[in-house]
């Protein structure tokens, strides 16, 4: 009998509010034994895969997706899904990335504290349809794997 895979979580470092031109790293986490993490983005058909998976703890693995220079086009909701043979997990909740103009004000913090979307109840059938128009992927030309070597 196949195991019931836990839903992944997604977080952003250093946070979910990123100044224009700064970097952000999405961190996807799942159980040990994950072969592939996929990062998808709402309203885009692009996505990004990595098999560069590291062990975050004895019971958890993770993958990191880095955007070196955030643009306005990178704003929006992101989510993770992972493949642990022989099947894919459910998608994570969406995590909203906000991109702000650099204000230069001394009192305005550069980023929100690190935010995440963790596992919740299994979504309804409609909410995890990766092909609905509201559910599309990444702007690949702006996205790099943090540790991925070719």
């Amino acid at each position: 009998q196949e195991e019931d895979l836990p839903r992944p979580s997604i977080s952003a470092e250093p946070g979910t509010v990123i100044p224009l031109g700064s970097h952000v790293t999405f961190v996807c986490r799942g159980p040990v034994g994950v072969q592939t993490f996929r990062l998808e983005r709402e309203s885009r058909s692009t996505y990004n895969d990595t098999e560069d998976v590291s062990q975050a703890s004895p019971s958890e693995s993770e993958a990191r997706f880095r955007i070196d220079s955030v643009s306005e086009g990178n704003a929006g909701p992101y989510r993770c899904i992972y493949y642990k043979p022989p099947k894919w997990s459910e998608q994570s909740d969406y995590l909203e990335l906000l991109v702000k103009e650099t204000s230069g004000g001394p009192d305005s913090p550069d980023t929100e504290p690190g935010s995440s979307a963790g596992p919740t109840q299994r979504p309804s059938d409609n909410s995890h349809n990766e092909h609905a128009p509201a559910s599309q992927g990444l702007k690949a030309e702006h996205l790099y794997h943090h540790h991925h070597h070719h």
């Epitope: 996505y47 895969d49 609905a132």
Partner: antibody, heavy 116, light 111 residues
Framework: QSVKESGGRLVTPGTPLTLTCTAS????????IQWVRQAPGKGLEYIGA?????YTYYASWAKGRVTISRTSTTVDLKMTSPTTEDTATYFC?????????????WGPGTLVTISS | ELVMTQTPASVSAAVGGTVTIKCQAS??????FAWYQQKPGQSPKLLIY???KLASGVPPRFKGSGSGTEFTLTISDLECDDAATYYC?????????????FGGGTEVVVK
Amino acid sequence: QSVKESGGRLVTPGTPLTLTCTASGFSLYKYNIQWVRQAPGKGLEYIGASTYAGYTYYASWAKGRVTISRTSTTVDLKMTSPTTEDTATYFCARHIDGDYSGYALWGPGTLVTISS
Amino acid sequence: ELVMTQTPASVSAAVGGTVTIKCQASQSIGTWFAWYQQKPGQSPKLLIYGPSKLASGVPPRFKGSGSGTEFTLTISDLECDDAATYYCQSNGGSISNGWGSFGGGTEVVVK
């Protein structure tokens, strides 16, 4: 990397027929596979798709008439009770790396003829 | 159900000319859209996806634009080899149907 359809042949109306799309040179688990058909002299017609995450979608006309299933290396299209209107070349196709919207990898097609 | 309406059904132009093909979706499909070229006896070939990205090996004479419900394929500096039937496809749409709807096709004749 390639996909290839097989199983097309001449059958009488009502005879179930299973077409198989076989993946070579890539890991099928990462990809969506769509089935498309083309009747002689006609345009392309979407039948349905098997997504990487295991969901299956059908064109409205195809619901109840076909069933799509997948294994680790193949995606099958079962025609439950074909009629003469189902005579066509059947294609399977795989989407490109990094984008769900475009299908760049197509098989050569397999011809299905339904005739009494 | 999602319907893709493609116009014109046929178009003729001279070598070196320009052809424009339009495709309209019955509902907003975002960027879940592609253009294909098909020649008689051959499988479809991906030209444009996303809906403005050029597929590998496709010359920049082919240009895709649009989003939402209105999409356009422009072929400039027409060559004899461009004679083919062109199809638009949306692989968006609702969960239950219409996810992979094709347009009716446009036959391009090069004079």
